[in-house]
Interface confidence: medium
């Protein structure tokens, strides 16, 4: 994250981390059901473990932290590298989330964002770019929904209704390592960071989103196929 | 029910190559969700076991025992099977060699082996 | 390098009695440990995993514990079935190994 400040404790419980060994993370993701993590289809690797209820980067001991393995990668069916349409996978963890105030899923909203919405993106990515610097601890971020034209305009021929944009001041933006995690919108979960410029956080290119509100059904029916 | 088969193994000259196949039923290697990884593990006659490599089928990448890096390839050759390659044999490579595979849900332990074959080089 | 040191080499217990197995990491491996049991011509069968956690099928007499570099497999009760070696493994890191395995615990029951 770009410009943005260390989130308030405990205020986001469905952030978790994926890790590579020993405890390297690569990507953002999140809770969205007891068992069940969203993250974004290119962050799939098979071998990594899941941390939640964690607030530091570094693998330092918190006392609300649960880890997980992924049992499960399930990417959308429509998700084909190179590209970005589709750009989500569902993971099952081993076992269910212990709820607790640092551990809880978030709802994935059923409605469309539209422009101007405020959101919240989270991560903890470098917080610098093109240079790479990651933080101490979970960053957040306040960023608008801009509309699919504003959007297609910064990013020509490579926009669907499978994502949509967001940003807010130049300077401000998610980045490297961030993937994967959430955009919330109004309490719920509209996004998962996507792709974007490089270097992050460029005027007029902003972070570019999964749009979940068109894969509620295809979540809900994947969670009920494979619990 | 998971099993693992190890094959290849036999009589072979010093400075010589051989590859031992894992051959796998009742999974895939190419399994697009489940979460594993396989590996070889070898043991010396009368000594402990040693790991030597494993690979993850979903992406195919690898890692390799510092020792064992540039002498000895694993790959997954097919739906079902896993190789190793060894390459400039002496008489400390004779062993036993197992496959094995590890799943997400045992954090990777290795929960499945093959009875192993036993590699002598003479 | 992480290098696991396991001790001790051998140890022989009575039917009945308990069997205390140590193995220390040369540096912190959470709590990524896992113990084997291998009989002679078997091949290894998997006890516990994430230093704690029973693996399937597995009599709860073995029991690990530990954290960080310190671990530990109790074995209680003992049976003339537990005569075998017992390896620990470490999964915290597959950078930079020698060998993920410890050196190996041989428990005779007499």
């Known amino acids: 994250i770009i410009n943005g400040s260390d989130c308030d404790m405990h205020t986001q419980p469905w952030q978790a981390a994926l890790l590579l060994r020993p405890n390297q993370l690569y990507c953002g993701a999140v809770l969205v059901h007891p068992q069940w993590l969203l993250t974004a289809a290119h962050c799939r690797k098979k071998v990594f473990r899941v941390r939640l209820g964690h607030y530091s980067l570094s693998p330092v001991y918190e006392s609300g932290q649960q880890m997980f393995q992924g049992v499960k990668s399930i990417p959308h069916p429509g998700y084909s590298h190179p590209g970005h349409s589709n750009d989500l996978m569902l993971i099952k963890l081993n076992r269910r989330i212990r709820p607790t105030k640092d551990v809880r899923p978030i709802n994935v909203s059923s409605h469309c964002p539209s422009a101007g919405t405020k959101c919240l993106v989270s991560g903890w990515g470098t917080t610098k770019s093109p240079q790479v610097h990651f933080p101490k601890v979970l960053q957040c971020l306040n960023i608008s929904v801009l509309s699919q034209k504003r959007c297609e305009d910064a990013y020509p021929r490579q926009i669907d209704d499978t994502m949509f944009c967001a940003g807010d001041k130049a300077g401000r933006d998610s980045c490297q390592g961030d993937s994967g995690g959430p955009v919330v919108c109004n309490g719920s979960l509209q996004g998962l960071v996507s792709w974007g410029d490089y270097p992050c956080a460029r005027p007029n290119r902003p972070g570019v989103y999964t749009n979940l509100c068109k894969f509620t059904k295809w979540i809900q029916e994947t969670i009920q196929a494979n619990s | 029910q998971e099993q693992l088969e190890e094959s290849g193994g036999g009589l072979v000259k010093p400075g010589a190559s051989l590859t031992l196949t894992c051959t796998v039923s009742g999974f895939s290697l190419t399994n697009n969700y489940v979460n594993f990884v396989m590996c070889w593990v070898r043991q010396a006659p009368g000594k402990g076991l040693e790991w030597i490599a494993s690979?993850?089928?979903?992406?195919?990448?690898t890692d390799y025992a510092s020792w064992a890096t540039g002498r000895f390839t694993i790959s997954k050759a097919s739906s079902t099977t896993v190789t190793l390659q060894v390459t400039s044999l002496t008489a400390a490579d004779t062993a036993t060699y197992f496959c094995a595979r590890g799943d997400a849900g045992t954090s990777y332990s290795f929960n499945f082996w093959g009875p192993g074959t036993l590699v002598t080089v003479s | 390098a992480i290098e696991m040191t396991q001790t001790p080499s051998s140890a022989s217990e009575p039917v009945g009695g308990t069997v205390t197995i140590k193995c220390q990491a040369s540096?912190?491996?959470?709590?990524?440990l896992s113990w084997y049991q291998q009989k002679p011509g078997q091949p290894p069968k998997l006890l516990i995993y994430?230093?704690?956690d029973l693996a399937s099928g597995v009599s709860s007499r073995f029991k690990g514990s530990g954290s960080g570099t310190q671990f530990t497999l109790i074995i209680s009760d003992v049976e003339c079935a537990d005569a075998a070696t017992y390896y620990c493994q470490q999964d915290y890191s597959r950078s930079n190994i020698v060998n993920s395995f410890g050196g190996g615990t041989e428990v005779v029951v007499k």
């Open positions: 994430d230093a704690s």
């Open positions: 540096e912190s491996i959470s709590r990524y």
């Open positions: 690979i993850d089928p979903g992406d195919d990448s």
